[in-house]
Interface confidence: medium
């Protein structure tokens, strides 16, 4: 007799995972996060090395174990690219070599970036005469990819996405966001730790250089750096004022930039032409005053002028060198690494450093993603997944297009263009075939790189130089739209507005997101929702501004654009109303998280409708053992369990200002509150917490 319950080992495994994570004693209509994740929360403690911990993070941890296994074993048959990846990994885990060198590799590097005044004897005499702002800022940028004070980079021209163009933007800051520089309340400790971190590193360098140490001088100079960076932070635009790509795009010639944004640094007029040439000449590209440049931050550049006139060359160089040095400290000996402890604690809440092998596996993966991707897919990727996911993408794309018909706020003309764009989305699944099949191409990618196993620091510098030089060279090249925007060994998924491309790396094609062996309700609630999420990014508050070819072109009628903003506003208010206890009760930023929230809500709806279509076509699936839930309910449960997790308070404070995603619990609650299908599946009465009468819907 058939009781309609699946008893295969895969079904038992799925059921066990779902049961362990959930807390069935919680009422699902009161708090679905607690219902779906209560068991997980009870069973798990954030590791000392983690700033947040959840199912997503666990998948990343497990991927790192695979990377460790494939990187630590040299094999005679390894191709050169793989040998290099393994050499880089070995140099990174070689702690005895790193510790024996102290800070010496950094000390050797400092003269190349005009030194660090606070840690240099007679800085003015050594560097003062040759120092210019143009050279000093350009050197850090062109050689090491470190953008300070002015962020000049080569990127895709938003309005003509087959070409590259120089961009000028505001820089990133030493602290996670501009808000931290208030230095009061929840940010006080971070500011103190930041300045102490500077002082500690300066002290270590002076000790190693056998230079006298004056604590008051160190404190004075580093507090001045903080003062300067505070002013720069205040000059930067807030993220919520930078989310309209049309307003961000200001194309002008270098001559116009010189006119509009004249700066005076160290008593001398700043030459934008010289500065740009200092950078581009490193890749043999010559720039004239007629060169087109896209300025993303005109207000910042205007506010920068009065700031820079107030500070000396010494002050500016202290900040610039520090911003580079702070990135390198973790790659030096134990003493230097430990100088960062209090800073790390203040920003991330972690009391221990990530295990060396994990940090190294991630570092090598980030720098040699194709070589590592090859090792990863050979070790851990089931090739047949590719075709199943291809089919899922086709279904969800189809649902997205069908759903356009239901939208009352969008007119026919704009719907037609939206359909064209959805059909033009190019998908990338798993990994680029070439990384496994084309040895020569892979070897050529890393041809210029040669690593030494006892010189990790120099290997890092080599990588920085290589990747920056590669990026700058692109200025006179066409955009390669076939290039993948992510490596294969990544637990994530992506949408690129300039390429109109969605990517699902091999790393995300695993349970709970996907398995050819698990119930389809789980696949649709997992990877199905992720597919819908990425497709919807093409139509969120950012992506909607780009056309089917990836160009920043307005394809909306005025009425539809206005209605889109109105529909979106509902989510801005909804998510902005969530108060996060872990971040001291601060409210989420509904504007900064809007794109991700639109994508979550759209993606879930599309995946659910695709699953309904699947059932219509194939019939109901067998139930899972030990769970008194039907497959519609399992769809929502699996979606939610992807986001089971929690944060350290320090990192909650950090991510509420820096992460464009809502925290996991609010991704679950916000999305499901807007889903009538969810409330139907769990029989939630009207106006219960999970079923408010007012629901937001964009797509």
């Amino acid at each position: 007799y058939d009781d309609g319950i699946c008893k295969s080992s895969d079904c038992i495994k799925s059921a066990a995972r779902l049961i362990q994570n959930m807390d069935a004693t919680t009422e699902p209509c009161t708090d679905f996060f607690k219902y779906a994740c209560g068991g997980w929360l009870k069973r798990n403690v954030i590791p000392e090395t983690s700033s947040r911990y959840g199912n997503f993070d666990i998948l990343r941890d497990e991927l790192e174990v695979v990377l460790k296994d494939v990187l630590q074993e040299p094999k005679t048959e390894d191709i050169v690219a793989v040998q290099k990846a393994k050499a880089l990994y070995r140099s990174c885990i070689n702690e005895s070599a790193i510790d024996s060198r102290g800070g010496e590799p950094l000390l050797k590097l400092l003269p190349d970036i005009y030194g660090w005044p606070v840690a240099t004897e007679n800085w003015e005499q050594k560097y003062g005469a040759s120092w210019t702002a143009e050279k000093a800022i350009a050197q850090l940028n062109s050689k090491y990819g470190k953008k300070v004070l002015i962020n000049l980079f080569v990127g895709t021209d938003d309005k003509n996405s087959v070409n590259h163009v120089i961009h000028i933007d505001q820089p990133r800051l030493g602290l996670p966001s501009r808000d931290y520089y208030e230095c009061t309340g929840i940010y006080k400790e971070a500011c103190t730790a930041y300045v102490d971190f500077m002082i500690s590193v300066a002290r270590l360098i002076r000790q190693e250089e056998r230079l006298p140490i004056d604590e008051n001088q160190l404190a004075l100079e580093m507090n001045k750096v903080m003062e300067l960076e505070k002013e720069i932070a205040n000059a930067t635009a807030k993220p919520e004022d930078r989310n309209d790509p049309m307003l961000l795009y200001n194309k002008m010639t270098l001559a116009q930039i010189q006119n509009n944004f004249s700066l005076e640094i160290n008593g001398k007029p700043f030459s934008w032409l010289n500065f740009t040439n200092e950078i581009m000449s490193t890749v043999n590209i010559s720039i004239t005053n007629e060169e087109d440049v896209v300025v993303y931050a005109p207000e910042y550049l205007t506010k920068l002028k009065p700031i820079l006139t107030k500070y000396s060359a010494r002050d500016l160089q202290n900040l610039m060198s520090w911003r580079f040095i702070m990135d390198l400290v973790s790659s030096l000996s134990r003493t230097y690494k430990e100088s960062r402890n209090a800073f790390r604690k203040a920003l991330y809440g972690t009391t221990s450093e990530t295990a060396t092998w994990r940090r190294c596996a991630n570092y090598v993966n980030g720098n040699m993603e194709n070589a590592v991707g090859r090792l990863y897919v050979e070790a851990a990727f089931a090739g047949e997944s590719k075709h199943v996911v291809e089919d899922l993408i086709a279904q969800i794309r189809e649902v997205f297009i069908q759903t356009l018909d239901d939208l009352t706020w969008m007119d026919a003309e704009t719907k037609k263009r939206a359909e064209e764009k959805a059909l033009a989305i190019k998908e990338r699944i798993g990994y680029p075939d070439d990384i496994v099949s084309n040895d020569n191409k892979l070897n050529n990618e890393y041809l210029e790189l040669n690593y030494k196993e006892d010189e990790y620091f120099e290997n890092i510098i080599q990588n920085l130089k290589f990747s920056q030089s590669k990026q700058l060279k692109k200025l006179r090249e066409k955009v390669d739209k076939d290039e993948w925007i992510s490596g294969a060994a990544v637990v994530n998924a992506f949408y690129s507005s300039g390429r109109n491309q969605i990517v699902f790396p091999a790393g995300i094609l695993q349970p709970p997101f996907f398995s050819a062996q698990q119930s389809n309700s789980l696949n649709y609630g997992g990877i199905g929702m992720v597919i819908g999420h990425e497709i919807t990014h093409g139509f969120d508050d950012n992506g909607r501004n780009f056309n089917k070819d990836g160009d920043l072109v307005d394809w909306w009628t005025q009425q539809s654009a206005s209605n889109f903003k109105e529909q979106s506003q509902c989510m801005v208010y909804q998510y902005g109303n969530f108060s996060w206890d872990l971040a001291g009760g601060q409210h989420l930023n509904g504007i900064n998280t809007l794109g991700e929230n639109i994508a979550d809500n759209g993606g879930l709806g599309q995946a659910y409708r695709a699953y309904q279509n699947y059932i219509k076509k194939n019939g109901e699936e067998k139930l899972l053992p030990g769970l008194d839930l039907n497959h519609k309910q399992l769809f929502f449960l699996n979606f939610a369990q992807v986001w089971c997790g929690t944060y350290r308070p320090e990192y909650a404070v950090n991510s509420i200002k820096t992460d464009v995603h809502s925290p996991g619990n609010f991704r679950i609650i916000g999305t499901l509150q807007n889903s009538a299908e969810f409330s139907e599946a769990f029989h939630c009465r009207k106006n219960s917490y999970m079923n408010p009468e007012k629901k937001c819907r964009v797509w």
């Epitope: 005044p117 004897e121 007679n122 800085w123 003015e124 005499q125 006298p212 140490i213 004056d214 604590e215 008051n216 001088q217 404190a219 004075l220 010494r314």
Partner: nanobody, 130 residues
């Protein structure tokens, strides 16, 4: 190498004045905090005053309002103008740089050791006596 040379000491009556100088060489004078430290006969080292690179000044409580520290970066020289001198101001006055401890600790600690500073002058004798 770093050299600090004090001058200007001497014998003075209570209520009188002296101006000490500290000539510096071998380093970028304008980039460093500078300090005056004294040692009374048979006593330990005591911090007197400090001046930072921007000309802000700091004093131990017993000399506030009587002593004035200043610097002339163009001449690589630091000064200590001592007015209304008292007998307890008698001692050897040293100029120093590269403090290993913060002013707050110099104040609270009272007594210093030679290792609290990286560089010292050879000192100049100040005697306040009638």
């Amino acid at each position: 190498q770093v050299q600090l040379q004090e001058s200007g000491g001497g014998l003075v009556q209570p209520g009188g004045s002296l101006r000490l100088s500290c000539a510096a060489s071998g380093f970028t004078f304008s980039s460093y905090w500078m300090y005056w430290v004294r040692q009374a006969p048979g006593k330990g080292l005591e911090w007197v005053s400090a001046i930072n690179t921007e000309g802000n000044t700091y004093y131990t409580d017993s000399v506030k309002g009587r002593f004035t520290i200043s610097r002339d970066n163009a001449r690589n020289t630091m000064y200590l103008q001592m007015d209304n001198l008292k007998s307890e101001d008698t001692g050897v006055y040293y100029c120093a740089k590269d403090a290993k401890i913060l002013i707050a600790r110099m104040r609270s600690q009272g007594r210093l050791s030679r290792s609290d500073f990286g560089s010292w002058g050879q000192g100049t004798q100040v005697t306040v006596s009638s």
